[in-house]
Interface confidence: low
Protein backbone atom coordinates (compact mmCIF):
# COMPACT_ATOMS: atom_id res chain seq x y z
CA UNK A 1 0.00 0.00 0.00
CA UNK A 2 1.34 3.44 -1.01
CA UNK A 3 2.17 5.94 1.77
CA UNK A 4 -0.67 7.00 4.02
CA UNK A 5 -3.47 6.84 1.46
CA UNK A 6 -6.70 5.37 2.86
CA UNK A 7 -7.33 1.90 1.52
CA UNK A 8 -9.81 2.03 -1.39
CA UNK A 9 -13.07 0.21 -0.83
CA UNK A 10 -14.50 -2.79 -2.64
CA UNK A 11 -18.17 -3.63 -2.27
CA UNK A 12 -20.90 -5.93 -3.53
CA UNK A 13 -23.98 -4.10 -4.82
CA UNK A 14 -26.19 -6.92 -3.52
CA UNK A 15 -25.74 -9.66 -0.93
CA UNK A 16 -22.33 -11.39 -0.99
CA UNK A 17 -24.21 -14.65 -0.25
CA UNK A 18 -25.00 -15.77 -3.79
CA UNK A 19 -26.95 -18.83 -4.96
CA UNK A 20 -25.37 -21.21 -7.43
CA UNK A 21 -25.73 -19.79 -10.96
CA UNK A 22 -26.63 -16.37 -9.50
CA UNK A 23 -24.83 -13.12 -10.17
CA UNK A 24 -23.43 -10.16 -8.26
CA UNK A 25 -22.05 -6.77 -9.19
CA UNK A 26 -18.78 -5.71 -7.56
CA UNK A 27 -17.71 -2.09 -7.33
CA UNK A 28 -14.12 -0.90 -6.94
CA UNK A 29 -13.62 2.63 -5.65
CA UNK A 30 -12.05 4.74 -8.40
CA UNK A 31 -8.70 6.27 -7.50
CA UNK A 32 -7.44 9.28 -9.40
CA UNK A 33 -3.91 8.17 -10.13
CA UNK A 34 -4.75 4.65 -11.43
CA UNK A 35 -4.83 4.16 -15.18
CA UNK A 36 -6.09 0.55 -14.85
CA UNK A 37 -8.31 -1.18 -12.30
CA UNK A 38 -8.27 -4.97 -12.11
CA UNK A 39 -10.60 -7.20 -10.13
CA UNK A 40 -8.64 -10.12 -8.68
CA UNK A 41 -9.68 -13.29 -6.89
CA UNK A 42 -7.25 -14.61 -4.29
CA UNK A 43 -6.96 -18.41 -4.33
CA UNK A 44 -4.28 -20.26 -2.36
CA UNK A 45 -2.38 -16.99 -1.88
CA UNK A 46 -2.21 -16.37 -5.63
CA UNK A 47 -4.03 -13.64 -7.55
CA UNK A 48 -6.08 -14.34 -10.67
CA UNK A 49 -7.57 -11.55 -12.75
CA UNK A 50 -11.34 -11.63 -13.17
CA UNK A 51 -11.74 -8.41 -15.13
CA UNK A 52 -10.12 -5.06 -15.93
CA UNK A 53 -11.23 -1.49 -16.61
CA UNK A 54 -9.14 1.23 -18.21
CA UNK A 55 -9.65 4.69 -16.75
CA UNK A 56 -11.62 7.22 -18.77
CA UNK A 57 -11.88 10.93 -18.09
CA UNK A 58 -15.49 10.65 -16.87
CA UNK A 59 -14.95 7.42 -14.95
CA UNK A 60 -17.24 6.56 -12.05
CA UNK A 61 -16.35 3.71 -9.69
CA UNK A 62 -15.52 0.71 -11.94
CA UNK A 63 -18.03 -2.15 -11.74
CA UNK A 64 -17.56 -5.82 -12.53
CA UNK A 65 -20.28 -8.47 -12.90
CA UNK A 66 -19.69 -11.99 -11.62
CA UNK A 67 -22.31 -14.23 -13.17
CA UNK A 68 -22.97 -17.97 -13.17
CA UNK A 69 -21.66 -18.10 -9.62
CA UNK A 70 -20.08 -21.42 -8.71
CA UNK A 71 -17.52 -22.97 -6.38
CA UNK A 72 -14.60 -21.64 -8.41
CA UNK A 73 -15.82 -18.04 -8.22
CA UNK A 74 -16.45 -18.04 -4.46
CA UNK A 75 -13.71 -16.63 -2.28
CA UNK A 76 -11.80 -13.42 -1.51
CA UNK A 77 -11.77 -10.57 -4.02
CA UNK A 78 -9.58 -7.49 -4.19
CA UNK A 79 -9.24 -4.53 -6.53
CA UNK A 80 -5.75 -3.97 -7.89
CA UNK A 81 -4.87 -0.50 -9.21
CA UNK A 82 -1.98 0.13 -11.60
CA UNK A 83 -0.37 3.48 -10.86
CA UNK A 84 2.68 3.04 -13.10
CA UNK A 85 4.44 0.17 -14.80
CA UNK A 86 5.64 -1.32 -11.54
CA UNK A 87 3.49 0.45 -8.95
CA UNK A 88 0.24 -0.93 -7.58
CA UNK A 89 -2.34 -0.12 -4.94
CA UNK A 90 -4.82 -2.57 -3.50
CA UNK A 91 -8.28 -2.25 -2.02
CA UNK A 92 -9.63 -3.94 1.03
CA UNK A 93 -10.90 -7.50 0.42
CA UNK A 94 -14.47 -8.71 -0.20
CA UNK A 95 -15.62 -12.25 0.52
CA UNK A 96 -18.21 -13.89 -1.75
CA UNK A 97 -19.99 -17.07 -0.73
CA UNK A 98 -21.85 -19.47 -3.03
CA UNK A 99 -24.86 -21.34 -1.66
CA UNK A 100 -26.51 -24.55 -2.82
CA UNK A 101 -23.55 -26.92 -2.52
CA UNK A 102 -25.03 -29.08 0.25
CA UNK A 103 -28.49 -30.01 1.50
CA UNK A 104 -30.34 -27.49 3.60
CA UNK A 105 -30.28 -27.43 7.40
CA UNK A 106 -33.35 -26.85 9.58
CA UNK A 107 -33.98 -23.66 11.54
CA UNK A 108 -36.18 -23.61 14.63
CA UNK A 109 -36.92 -21.26 17.53
CA UNK A 110 -37.21 -21.89 21.26
CA UNK A 111 -40.32 -19.70 21.59
CA UNK A 112 -42.94 -17.82 19.59
CA UNK A 113 -41.70 -15.54 16.85
CA UNK A 114 -43.49 -12.36 17.96
CA UNK A 115 -41.42 -10.58 20.63
CA UNK A 116 -41.42 -7.40 22.65
CA UNK A 117 -38.27 -5.23 22.76
CA UNK A 118 -35.88 -6.50 25.42
CA UNK A 119 -36.97 -10.13 25.16
CA UNK A 120 -34.64 -12.98 24.20
CA UNK A 121 -34.97 -15.69 21.60
CA UNK A 122 -32.69 -18.51 20.56
CA UNK A 123 -32.67 -19.91 17.02
CA UNK A 124 -31.29 -23.41 16.45
CA UNK A 125 -29.81 -24.59 13.18
CA UNK A 126 -29.38 -28.34 12.73
CA UNK A 127 -28.68 -30.89 10.01
CA UNK A 128 -29.49 -34.51 10.65
CA UNK A 129 -27.82 -35.94 7.55
CA UNK A 130 -24.85 -33.70 6.83
CA UNK A 131 -22.09 -33.27 9.42
CA UNK A 132 -21.39 -29.56 8.96
CA UNK A 133 -18.77 -28.12 11.28
CA UNK A 134 -19.95 -24.51 10.88
CA UNK A 135 -23.31 -22.75 10.63
CA UNK A 136 -24.16 -19.15 9.73
CA UNK A 137 -27.39 -17.31 10.46
CA UNK A 138 -28.41 -14.74 7.86
CA UNK A 139 -31.04 -12.03 7.89
CA UNK A 140 -32.76 -11.38 4.58
CA UNK A 141 -31.81 -8.10 2.93
CA UNK A 142 -28.49 -7.57 4.68
CA UNK A 143 -25.64 -6.61 2.37
CA UNK A 144 -22.77 -8.10 4.36
CA UNK A 145 -21.77 -11.63 5.27
CA UNK A 146 -23.72 -12.95 8.28
CA UNK A 147 -22.08 -12.02 11.56
CA UNK A 148 -23.70 -14.86 13.49
CA UNK A 149 -21.58 -18.01 13.27
CA UNK A 150 -21.35 -21.16 15.31
CA UNK A 151 -19.06 -24.15 15.41
CA UNK A 152 -21.48 -26.28 17.42
CA UNK A 153 -23.89 -28.86 16.03
CA UNK A 154 -26.69 -28.08 16.41
CA UNK A 155 -25.89 -24.39 16.40
CA UNK A 156 -27.65 -22.09 18.85
CA UNK A 157 -27.91 -18.41 17.96
CA UNK A 158 -29.03 -16.21 20.83
CA UNK A 159 -30.70 -13.01 19.73
CA UNK A 160 -31.47 -10.58 22.46
CA UNK A 161 -32.26 -8.54 24.23
CA UNK A 162 -33.97 -7.71 20.93
CA UNK A 163 -34.91 -4.32 19.55
CA UNK A 164 -37.10 -3.37 16.59
CA UNK A 165 -34.17 -3.81 14.17
CA UNK A 166 -34.09 -7.55 14.86
CA UNK A 167 -37.40 -7.96 12.99
CA UNK A 168 -36.94 -9.77 9.71
CA UNK A 169 -36.67 -13.09 7.92
CA UNK A 170 -33.86 -15.42 9.02
CA UNK A 171 -32.30 -18.47 7.39
CA UNK A 172 -29.27 -20.52 8.30
CA UNK A 173 -26.59 -22.24 6.24
CA UNK A 174 -24.20 -25.08 6.91
CA UNK A 175 -20.61 -25.22 5.73
CA UNK A 176 -17.20 -26.73 6.40
CA UNK A 177 -14.09 -25.07 7.83
CA UNK A 178 -12.02 -26.46 4.97
CA UNK A 179 -14.28 -24.74 2.38
CA UNK A 180 -15.50 -21.56 4.08
CA UNK A 181 -16.99 -20.02 0.90
CA UNK A 182 -19.09 -23.04 -0.09
CA UNK A 183 -22.38 -23.07 1.78
CA UNK A 184 -25.48 -25.24 1.84
CA UNK A 185 -28.87 -24.41 0.45
CA UNK A 186 -30.67 -21.98 2.77
CA UNK A 187 -32.74 -23.50 5.55
CA UNK A 188 -36.45 -22.91 5.95
CA UNK A 189 -37.21 -19.28 6.76
CA UNK A 190 -38.34 -17.94 10.15
CA UNK A 191 -39.86 -14.47 10.39
CA UNK A 192 -39.19 -12.66 13.67
CA UNK A 193 -41.49 -9.79 14.54
CA UNK A 194 -40.42 -7.38 17.29
CA UNK A 195 -43.21 -5.00 18.21
CA UNK A 196 -43.88 -2.66 21.09
CA UNK A 197 -47.61 -3.05 20.43
CA UNK A 198 -48.70 -6.55 21.37
CA UNK A 199 -52.30 -5.81 20.37
CA UNK A 200 -51.70 -6.04 16.64
CA UNK A 201 -52.31 -9.27 14.75
CA UNK A 202 -49.16 -10.80 13.30
CA UNK A 203 -48.92 -13.87 11.15
CA UNK A 204 -45.59 -15.58 10.81
CA UNK A 205 -44.77 -17.75 7.85
CA UNK A 206 -42.33 -20.56 7.21
Amino acid sequence: QEGDFPMPFISAKSSPVIPLDGSVKIQCQAIREAYLTQLMIIKNSTYREIGRRLKFWNETDPEFVIDHMDANKAGRYQCQYRIGHYRFRYSDTLELVVTGLYGKPFLSADRGLVLMPGENISLTCSSAHIPFDRFSLAKEGELSLPQHQSGEHPANFSLGPVDLNVSGIYRCYGWYNRSPYLWSFPSNALELVVTDSIHQDYTTQN
Partner: antibody, heavy 116, light 107 residues
Protein backbone atom coordinates in the same frame (compact mmCIF):
# COMPACT_ATOMS: atom_id res chain seq x y z
CA UNK B 1 -25.11 -29.44 -22.78
CA UNK B 2 -25.65 -31.25 -19.49
CA UNK B 3 -25.33 -35.02 -19.81
CA UNK B 4 -25.04 -37.96 -17.42
CA UNK B 5 -24.32 -41.55 -18.41
CA UNK B 6 -24.39 -44.58 -16.15
CA UNK B 7 -22.31 -47.67 -16.81
CA UNK B 8 -22.75 -50.86 -14.82
CA UNK B 9 -22.15 -54.61 -14.96
CA UNK B 10 -25.65 -55.61 -16.09
CA UNK B 11 -25.69 -58.89 -14.19
CA UNK B 12 -24.67 -59.41 -10.56
CA UNK B 13 -24.76 -62.66 -8.57
CA UNK B 14 -26.65 -62.68 -5.27
CA UNK B 15 -24.55 -61.59 -2.23
CA UNK B 16 -22.03 -59.91 -4.55
CA UNK B 17 -21.40 -56.16 -4.73
CA UNK B 18 -22.44 -53.67 -7.38
CA UNK B 19 -20.36 -50.82 -8.80
CA UNK B 20 -21.84 -48.24 -11.16
CA UNK B 21 -20.09 -45.21 -12.62
CA UNK B 22 -21.89 -42.03 -13.64
CA UNK B 23 -19.85 -39.96 -16.09
CA UNK B 24 -21.02 -36.38 -16.46
CA UNK B 25 -20.38 -33.58 -18.93
CA UNK B 26 -21.57 -30.01 -19.35
CA UNK B 27 -21.12 -29.16 -15.67
CA UNK B 28 -18.58 -29.48 -12.89
CA UNK B 29 -18.90 -31.85 -9.96
CA UNK B 30 -17.39 -29.12 -7.77
CA UNK B 31 -20.53 -27.06 -8.36
CA UNK B 32 -23.37 -29.60 -8.44
CA UNK B 33 -24.36 -32.63 -6.43
CA UNK B 34 -25.35 -35.94 -8.01
CA UNK B 35 -28.20 -38.15 -6.81
CA UNK B 36 -28.69 -41.88 -7.29
CA UNK B 37 -32.22 -43.23 -7.78
CA UNK B 38 -33.43 -46.69 -8.72
CA UNK B 39 -36.62 -48.17 -10.14
CA UNK B 40 -37.33 -51.91 -9.85
CA UNK B 41 -39.27 -53.34 -12.83
CA UNK B 42 -42.93 -52.29 -12.65
CA UNK B 43 -42.41 -50.48 -9.34
CA UNK B 44 -41.89 -46.97 -8.06
CA UNK B 45 -38.79 -44.79 -7.70
CA UNK B 46 -36.50 -45.07 -4.69
CA UNK B 47 -33.94 -42.43 -3.76
CA UNK B 48 -30.62 -43.96 -2.75
CA UNK B 49 -28.43 -40.99 -1.86
CA UNK B 50 -26.49 -37.96 -3.03
CA UNK B 51 -22.92 -36.79 -3.09
CA UNK B 52 -22.95 -33.02 -2.68
CA UNK B 53 -20.73 -30.65 -4.64
CA UNK B 54 -18.59 -30.14 -1.55
CA UNK B 55 -17.98 -33.89 -1.25
CA UNK B 56 -20.16 -34.93 1.68
CA UNK B 57 -22.85 -37.56 1.24
CA UNK B 58 -26.42 -38.19 2.35
CA UNK B 59 -27.94 -41.67 2.15
CA UNK B 60 -31.31 -43.33 2.40
CA UNK B 61 -31.06 -44.74 5.92
CA UNK B 62 -32.80 -47.96 4.82
CA UNK B 63 -29.81 -48.74 2.58
CA UNK B 64 -27.05 -46.85 4.36
CA UNK B 65 -25.22 -49.92 5.67
CA UNK B 66 -24.77 -51.31 2.13
CA UNK B 67 -24.28 -48.10 0.19
CA UNK B 68 -21.31 -45.91 -0.62
CA UNK B 69 -21.15 -42.93 -2.99
CA UNK B 70 -17.88 -41.28 -4.00
CA UNK B 71 -16.57 -39.18 -6.88
CA UNK B 72 -13.55 -38.05 -8.83
CA UNK B 73 -14.01 -34.38 -9.70
CA UNK B 74 -11.12 -34.33 -12.16
CA UNK B 75 -12.55 -37.24 -14.17
CA UNK B 76 -16.15 -35.98 -13.87
CA UNK B 77 -17.21 -39.34 -12.47
CA UNK B 78 -19.47 -40.36 -9.60
CA UNK B 79 -19.42 -43.89 -8.21
CA UNK B 80 -22.14 -45.94 -6.55
CA UNK B 81 -21.12 -49.05 -4.65
CA UNK B 82 -23.66 -51.37 -3.08
CA UNK B 83 -22.86 -54.53 -1.13
CA UNK B 84 -24.72 -57.81 -0.47
CA UNK B 85 -27.10 -57.61 -3.41
CA UNK B 86 -30.29 -59.65 -3.41
CA UNK B 87 -32.84 -60.30 -6.16
CA UNK B 88 -35.00 -57.38 -4.99
CA UNK B 89 -32.11 -55.03 -5.83
CA UNK B 90 -32.82 -55.74 -9.51
CA UNK B 91 -33.67 -52.33 -10.94
CA UNK B 92 -32.83 -49.54 -13.35
CA UNK B 93 -30.24 -47.38 -11.61
CA UNK B 94 -30.13 -43.68 -12.49
CA UNK B 95 -27.85 -40.80 -11.64
CA UNK B 96 -29.31 -37.29 -11.71
CA UNK B 97 -27.82 -33.83 -11.33
CA UNK B 98 -28.99 -31.84 -8.36
CA UNK B 99 -30.73 -28.52 -8.97
CA UNK B 100 -32.21 -26.51 -6.11
CA UNK B 101 -32.11 -29.66 -3.98
CA UNK B 102 -33.94 -31.69 -6.63
CA UNK B 103 -33.38 -33.63 -9.86
CA UNK B 104 -33.24 -31.64 -13.10
CA UNK B 105 -31.12 -33.77 -15.44
CA UNK B 106 -31.04 -37.55 -15.49
CA UNK B 107 -28.93 -40.23 -17.09
CA UNK B 108 -30.51 -42.90 -19.30
CA UNK B 109 -30.12 -45.44 -16.53
CA UNK B 110 -28.39 -48.81 -16.39
CA UNK B 111 -30.28 -52.05 -15.79
CA UNK B 112 -28.85 -54.21 -13.02
CA UNK B 113 -30.18 -57.76 -12.73
CA UNK B 114 -29.38 -59.78 -9.63
CA UNK B 115 -29.51 -63.44 -10.54
CA UNK B 116 -27.56 -66.62 -10.11
CA UNK C 1 -40.27 -41.24 5.89
CA UNK C 2 -42.75 -38.94 4.19
CA UNK C 3 -45.31 -40.87 2.17
CA UNK C 4 -46.34 -39.29 -1.14
CA UNK C 5 -49.73 -40.44 -2.41
CA UNK C 6 -50.24 -39.61 -6.08
CA UNK C 7 -53.50 -39.83 -7.99
CA UNK C 8 -54.77 -40.94 -10.36
CA UNK C 9 -52.43 -43.79 -11.24
CA UNK C 10 -53.48 -43.49 -14.87
CA UNK C 11 -55.83 -41.43 -17.01
CA UNK C 12 -57.00 -41.47 -20.62
CA UNK C 13 -57.27 -38.00 -22.10
CA UNK C 14 -57.53 -36.31 -25.47
CA UNK C 15 -55.28 -33.83 -27.24
CA UNK C 16 -56.14 -30.29 -26.16
CA UNK C 17 -57.56 -31.37 -22.79
CA UNK C 18 -56.46 -29.86 -19.49
CA UNK C 19 -55.46 -32.37 -16.84
CA UNK C 20 -54.47 -32.21 -13.19
CA UNK C 21 -52.45 -34.73 -11.22
CA UNK C 22 -52.39 -34.49 -7.45
CA UNK C 23 -49.96 -35.51 -4.74
CA UNK C 24 -50.72 -35.67 -1.03
CA UNK C 25 -47.83 -35.75 1.45
CA UNK C 26 -48.18 -37.44 4.82
CA UNK C 27 -47.13 -34.15 6.44
CA UNK C 28 -46.65 -30.48 5.58
CA UNK C 29 -43.76 -30.22 3.10
CA UNK C 30 -43.81 -26.41 2.65
CA UNK C 31 -43.70 -26.51 -1.16
CA UNK C 32 -40.58 -28.68 -1.14
CA UNK C 33 -41.98 -30.69 -4.04
CA UNK C 34 -40.95 -31.30 -7.62
CA UNK C 35 -42.56 -32.92 -10.62
CA UNK C 36 -40.83 -35.23 -13.09
CA UNK C 37 -41.75 -36.51 -16.54
CA UNK C 38 -40.70 -39.82 -18.10
CA UNK C 39 -41.54 -40.32 -21.77
CA UNK C 40 -41.87 -43.90 -23.08
CA UNK C 41 -38.45 -45.45 -23.57
CA UNK C 42 -36.73 -42.31 -22.31
CA UNK C 43 -35.25 -41.13 -19.05
CA UNK C 44 -36.63 -38.63 -16.57
CA UNK C 45 -36.78 -34.89 -16.90
CA UNK C 46 -37.39 -32.31 -14.17
CA UNK C 47 -40.45 -30.15 -14.86
CA UNK C 48 -41.13 -28.16 -11.71
CA UNK C 49 -39.27 -27.42 -8.49
CA UNK C 50 -40.31 -25.64 -5.28
CA UNK C 51 -43.93 -26.43 -6.10
CA UNK C 52 -44.42 -23.81 -8.78
CA UNK C 53 -41.12 -23.01 -10.55
CA UNK C 54 -40.61 -24.32 -14.08
CA UNK C 55 -37.24 -25.85 -14.92
CA UNK C 56 -35.44 -24.26 -17.87
CA UNK C 57 -37.01 -25.07 -21.24
CA UNK C 58 -40.28 -26.45 -19.83
CA UNK C 59 -43.32 -25.14 -21.76
CA UNK C 60 -45.64 -22.74 -19.93
CA UNK C 61 -48.61 -25.10 -20.37
CA UNK C 62 -47.16 -26.94 -17.35
CA UNK C 63 -47.89 -25.39 -13.97
CA UNK C 64 -47.64 -26.43 -10.36
CA UNK C 65 -49.67 -25.32 -7.37
CA UNK C 66 -50.44 -26.23 -3.80
CA UNK C 67 -49.29 -25.73 -0.23
CA UNK C 68 -49.05 -27.61 3.03
CA UNK C 69 -49.47 -31.28 2.19
CA UNK C 70 -51.49 -31.04 -1.06
CA UNK C 71 -50.06 -30.25 -4.48
CA UNK C 72 -51.04 -30.56 -8.10
CA UNK C 73 -49.48 -30.51 -11.55
CA UNK C 74 -51.69 -29.09 -14.30
CA UNK C 75 -51.07 -29.49 -18.02
CA UNK C 76 -53.27 -27.27 -20.17
CA UNK C 77 -53.95 -27.89 -23.87
CA UNK C 78 -52.30 -31.31 -23.95
CA UNK C 79 -49.98 -31.96 -26.86
CA UNK C 80 -48.94 -35.36 -28.20
CA UNK C 81 -45.48 -35.10 -26.59
CA UNK C 82 -47.10 -34.77 -23.15
CA UNK C 83 -48.31 -38.38 -23.06
CA UNK C 84 -45.89 -39.82 -20.53
CA UNK C 85 -45.49 -40.88 -16.91
CA UNK C 86 -45.41 -38.16 -14.24
CA UNK C 87 -44.05 -38.38 -10.71
CA UNK C 88 -44.01 -36.05 -7.74
CA UNK C 89 -41.08 -36.05 -5.32
CA UNK C 90 -40.66 -34.37 -1.94
CA UNK C 91 -37.41 -32.93 -0.68
CA UNK C 92 -38.56 -31.50 2.65
CA UNK C 93 -36.77 -34.34 4.42
CA UNK C 94 -34.34 -37.17 3.84
CA UNK C 95 -34.88 -39.61 2.31
CA UNK C 96 -36.36 -38.05 -0.80
CA UNK C 97 -39.60 -39.91 -1.54
CA UNK C 98 -41.65 -40.20 -4.72
CA UNK C 99 -45.29 -40.55 -5.60
CA UNK C 100 -46.35 -43.77 -7.31
CA UNK C 101 -46.63 -42.11 -10.70
CA UNK C 102 -49.41 -41.22 -13.14
CA UNK C 103 -49.57 -42.60 -16.68
CA UNK C 104 -51.18 -40.24 -19.20
CA UNK C 105 -52.60 -42.18 -22.13
CA UNK C 106 -54.33 -41.04 -25.31
CA UNK C 107 -58.05 -41.68 -25.31
Amino acid sequence: RVQLKESGPGLVAPSQSLSITCTVSGFSLTSYGVHWVRQPPGKGLEWLGIIWAGGSTSYNSALMSRLSISKDNSKSQVFLKMNSLQTDDTAMYYCARDHYDLFAYWGQGTLVTVSA
Amino acid sequence: DILMTQSPSSMSVSLGDTVSITCHASQDISRNIGWLQQKPGKSFKGLIYHGTNLEDGVPSRFSGSGSGADYSLTISSLESEDFADYYCVQYAQFPRTFGGGTKLEIK
